[in-house]
């Protein structure tokens, strides 16, 4: 499926606190992003 939200800002985090410190992290937690990333499995044990 196409991704309505791109993923150029994957490093952004949301820091709760004063309103001025908020970051828009919705793209990183969007349905579109989840479709891109899928369910990432745990790495295999060696």
């Amino acid at each position: 499926l196409a991704d309505p939200l791109d993923h150029r800002d994957a490093g952004d985090l949301w820091f709760p606190g004063e309103s001025e410190s908020f970051e828009d992290a919705h793209v990183e937690h969007s349905i579109s992003r989840s479709l891109l990333e899928g369910e990432i499995p745990f790495p295999p044990t060696s």
């Epitope: 499926l1 800002d9 709760p16 309103s19 828009d24 969007s30 349905i31």
Partner: antibody
Framework: EVQLVESGGGLVQPGGSLKLSCATS????????MHWVRQASGKGLEWIAH??????????YYAESVKGRFTISRDDSKTTIYLQMNSLKTEDTAVYYC?????WGQGTTVTVSS | DVVMTQSPLSLPVTPGEPASISCRSS???????????LYWYLQKPGQSPQLLIY???NLASGVPDRFSGSGSGTDFTLKISRVEAEDVGVYYC?????????FGPGTKVEIK
């Protein structure tokens, strides 16, 4: 195909309660932040509630208009979010949408009237 | 609360002609990461809202490139380069930076 399907709307008397559900499918649900947005007839959009993911301790946020009366929750095993609405008022009458902000459901209608 | 205002509230348009909607926020929506948390939605008659633009200027997937978003920290513009009949509906700007999240009042776009 991504689907968000709201249910649970209906007619309720002032002071009553209602629980809305939003069943999702077609995407990995657990890391997605979800919201409820409502729209009174002929009016604009009003954000009312937000729930983050397990990794964010399921943090919740509310609009002042519903704080203390509405509760947003999620069941990751059922890929469903909920909106428990108590002490309903006539001004809560609206179409309620669940959304990830990029995808939206079709909405469910809540009517509060005596 | 962050107040979002839009103008005009009603916009008669001619197919094939350009159109522009303005949105203003009562505080800057620019984050410390350089992201501007301004989103545009279109709600077509009888439908749910659909995302057009996110983070001020990014076109959502499946949205025709005749739509574009621009602006600064508090003043934003949605432009349609050539309006088509399917573009009618109510356009909303929104901010998802500061709680409570807020939408503009909407701009109703109709064909002349």
């Amino acid at each position: 195909e991504v689907q968000l399907v709201e249910s649970g709307g209906g007619l309720v008397q002032p002071g009553g309660s209602l629980k809305l559900s939003c069943a999702t499918s077609g995407f990995p649900f657990s890391n997605v932040w979800m919201h409820w947005v409502r729209q009174a007839s002929g009016k604009g959009l009003e954000w009312i509630a937000h729930i983050k993911a397990k990794s964010d301790n399921y943090a919740t946020y509310y609009a002042e208009s519903v704080k203390g009366r509405f509760t947003i929750s999620r069941d990751d095993s059922k890929t469903t979010i909920y909106l428990q609405m108590n002490s309903l008022k006539t001004e809560d009458t609206a179409v309620y949408y669940c959304t990830g902000l990029d995808y939206w459901g079709q909405g469910t209608t809540v009517t509060v009237s005596s | 609360d962050v107040v979002m205002t839009q103008s005009p509230l009603s916009l008669p348009v001619t197919p094939g002609e350009p159109a522009s909607i303005s949105c203003r926020s009562s505080r800057s929506l620019l984050t410390s990461k350089g992201i501007t948390s301004l989103y545009w939605y279109l709600q077509k008659p009888g439908q749910s809202p659909q995302l057009l633009i996110y983070r001020m200027s990014n076109l959502a997937s499946g949205v025709p490139d005749r739509f574009s978003g621009s602006g600064s920290g508090t003043d934003f513009t949605l432009k349609i380069s050539r309006v088509e009949a399917e573009d009618v509906g109510v356009y909303y700007c929104a901010q998802f930076l500061v709680y409570p999240y807020t939408f503009g009042p909407g701009t109703k776009v109709e064909i002349k």
